[in-house]
């Protein structure tokens, strides 16, 4: 029912942190901000390769290098995160491979999730050697600015020592940081001198200061957190799908449409039809019949199966996918051959009995 226009509008601001509605799960490449990333296009016999990010053509620039089947991103930033695709164009067909890039301080402050080296941060002092607090691992504190995509986990660390063992407390924007200040609260692991916030949201942006003190002194260190929201995009359809098909009269066939979308998408299968011998209505609008439509979470929304086809079923079939940001559509042709003539290069596909059409 949604409009069939080839013009997409993508200027709209995001609403909530998007859920992924990916029918096919692409590989995920993770890099920390500032790192370089190299990805090889995993397609065979690639004569010409083109690259896209979030459905938009990707060309070389001062940070993006495209050499043959390799994509290099230098000095990655969270804004490089997204859905990438390389398409290999061949003489007879094309193939697309999708992958995700996630540039993130998923566990910030240069640390891994398990804190396996945490023990070395917990320094035991001789009880007679009184000492004001001091930092034990400044390398883990060098990076003060942390830009993290929404919904990720952030960890700030202030490994310290002192005698007696110092205590640690955290401030947000210079004020005491309380559990009720954020949905889901936060965790403090004193033995690892860390503050952990899960599933960060834009309201978590700000300055976080660890204050480490004992009776002989006090030290502090401030981190700045920026939560980067990845803008949802209009749906992206896998190149080459749906694929052209042919079958004999009475045969069965299916078309498949693979979708990548941040916001919840809706799939429609559409065909140009004639009514009363005309392709256009009295209102001048073409007769585009919606054969099937449903949300992506419905079973087999991405598959259109046609059973016992007739010559009237021949023609163009359009897979149209829309979300609140925009839409995308791709089409394929069905050729219906006389009973005695076998299908050509595009072999008949037998449909599973699960499908409705």
């Amino acid at each position: 029912r949604p409009s069939f226009s080839l013009v997409e509008d993508t200027t709209l601001e995001p609403e909530e942190p998007p859920t992924k509605y990916q029918i096919s799960q692409p590989e995920v490449y993770v890099a920390a901000p500032g790192e370089s990333l190299e990805v090889r296009c995993l397609l065979k016999d690639a004569a010409v390769i083109s690259w896209t990010k979030d459905g938009v053509h990707l060309g070389p620039n001062n940070r993006t290098v495209l050499i043959g089947e390799y994509l290099q991103i230098k000095g990655a930033t969270p804004r490089d995160s997204g859905l990438y695709a390389c398409t290999a164009s061949r003489t007879v067909d094309s193939e697309t491979w999708y992958f995700m890039v996630n540039v993130t301080d998923a566990i910030s402050s240069g640390d891994d999730e398990d804190d396996t080296d945490g023990a070395e941060d917990f320094v035991s002092e001789n009880s007679n050697n009184k000492r004001a607090p001091y930092w034990t691992n400044t390398e883990k504190m060098e990076k003060r600015l942390h830009a993290v995509p929404a919904a990720n986990t952030v960890k700030f660390r202030c490994p310290a020592g002192g005698n007696p063992m110092p205590t640690m407390r955290w401030l947000k924007n210079g004020k005491e940081f309380k559990q009720e200040h954020r949905i889901g609260g936060y965790k403090v692991r004193n033995q690892h001198w860390s503050l952990i916030m899960e599933s960060v949201v834009p309201s978590d942006k700000g300055n976080y200061t660890c204050v480490v003190e004992n009776e002989y002194g006090s030290i502090n260190h401030t981190y700045h957190l920026d939560v980067v929201e990845r803008s949802p995009h209009r749906p992206i359809l896998q190149a080459g799908l749906p694929a052209n098909a042919s079958t004999v009269v009475g045969g069965d066939v299916e078309f498949v449409c693979k979708v990548y979308s941040d916001a919840q998408p809706h799939i429609q299968w559409i065909k140009h039809v004639e009514k009363n011998g005309s392709k256009y209505g009295p209102d001048g609008l073409p007769y585009l019949k919606v054969l099937k439509h449903s949300g992506i979470n419905s079973s087999n929304a991405e598959v259109l199966a046609l059973f016992n086809v007739t010559e009237a079923d021949a023609g163009e079939y359009i897979c149209k996918v829309s979300n609140y940001i925009g839409q995308a559509n791709q089409s394929a042709w069905l050729t219906v051959l006389p009973k005695q003539q076998a299908p050509g290069r595009e072999k008949e596909i037998t449909a599973s009995p699960d499908y409705l059409e």
């Epitope: 029912r1 949604p2 409009s3 069939f4 226009s5 013009v7 509008d9 709209l12 809706h266 429609q268 559409i270 209505g281 209102d283 609008l285 073409p286 007769y287 585009l288 019949k289 919606v290 099937k292 439509h293 449903s294 949300g295 419905s298 829309s322 979300n323 609140y324 940001i325 925009g326 409705l356 059409e357």
Partner: antibody, heavy 120, light 107 residues
Framework: EVQLQQSGPELVKPGASVKISCKAS????????MNWVKQSHGKSLEWIGD????????SYNQKFRDKATLTVDKSSSTVYMELRSLSSEDSAVYYC?????????????WGQGTSVTVSS | DIVMTQSHKLMSTSLGDRVSITCKAS??????VAWYQQKPGQSPSLLIY???TRHTGVPDRFTGSGSGTDFTLTINNVQSEDLADYFC?????????FGGGTKLEIK
């Protein structure tokens, strides 16, 4: 002439279920979709979902996915909507509305409505 | 979900006047907007679809316009039988949504 004849008013108890019907005539039933729309307080309209009258495929508004179930009986050109676990918030007039299935067209013909009152 | 906002809940007009009822979509809905009229005690009936196409049998004093996010239903030479509630409806993106309605009354 397109006609959609809905079943009569229903008075049901909280927690119960109700099944209302919509019988279509005057057009090729199997070429269309039947939508259901809720109207509360005589004002706001909410789309519940639709059903393909040929193969029975359904699409629901997420808000009503656990509330409504749409079914079709092609032999009698009748569409049904079952509402379950009813509460006072479900008290409303429910309309069946035809859509001819053409992309540029909107829903065009409405039934007379079925009033559902949920009360103990 | 796309929100359709009809900012005027009530509009007063005089017979023979021209009145414009507006509707704003929270996101681009192209021209996939319909307008429905609902008279007291009756079911809604279709006036306009595809933003500006009059449904069969609708008088030509009803005109629809707009695209993208801003839409208008204009009634020229208002008649007494036009006093009703008017709803805009977007069918560009699922779930389908409706505006809150505008009641047209005589001054």
């Amino acid at each position: 002439e397109v006609q959609l004849q809905q079943s009569g008013p229903e008075l049901v108890k909280p927690g119960a279920s109700v099944k209302i019907s919509c019988k279509a005539s005057g057009y090729t039933f199997s070429d269309s979709y039947m939508n259901w729309v809720k109207q509360s307080h005589g004002k706001s309209l909410e789309w519940i979902g639709d059903i393909n009258c040929n193969h029975g495929g359904t699409s629901y508004n997420q808000k009503f996915r656990d509330k409504a179930t749409l079914t079709v009986d092609k032999s009698s050109s009748t569409v049904y909507m079952e509402l379950r676990s009813l509460s006072s918030e479900d008290s409303a007039v429910y309309y069946c509305v035809r859509w001819d299935g053409f992309l540029y067209h909107s829903m065009d013909s409405w039934g007379q409505g079925t009033s559902v009152t949920v009360s103990s | 979900d796309i929100v359709m906002t009809q900012s005027h809940k009530l509009m007063s007009t005089s017979l023979g006047d021209r009145v414009s009822i507006t509707c704003k979509a929270s996101h681009n809905v192209d021209t996939a907007v319909a307008w429905y009229q609902q008279k007291p005690g009756q079911s809604p009936s279709l006036l306009i679809y595809w933003a500006s196409t009059r449904h069969t049998g609708v008088p030509d004093r009803f005109t629809g316009s707009g695209s993208g996010t801003d839409f208008t239903l204009t009634i020229n030479n208002v008649q007494s039988e036009d006093l009703a509630d008017y709803f805009c409806h977007q069918y560009n993106t699922y779930p389908l949504t409706f505006g809150g309605g505008t009641k047209l009354e005589i001054k």
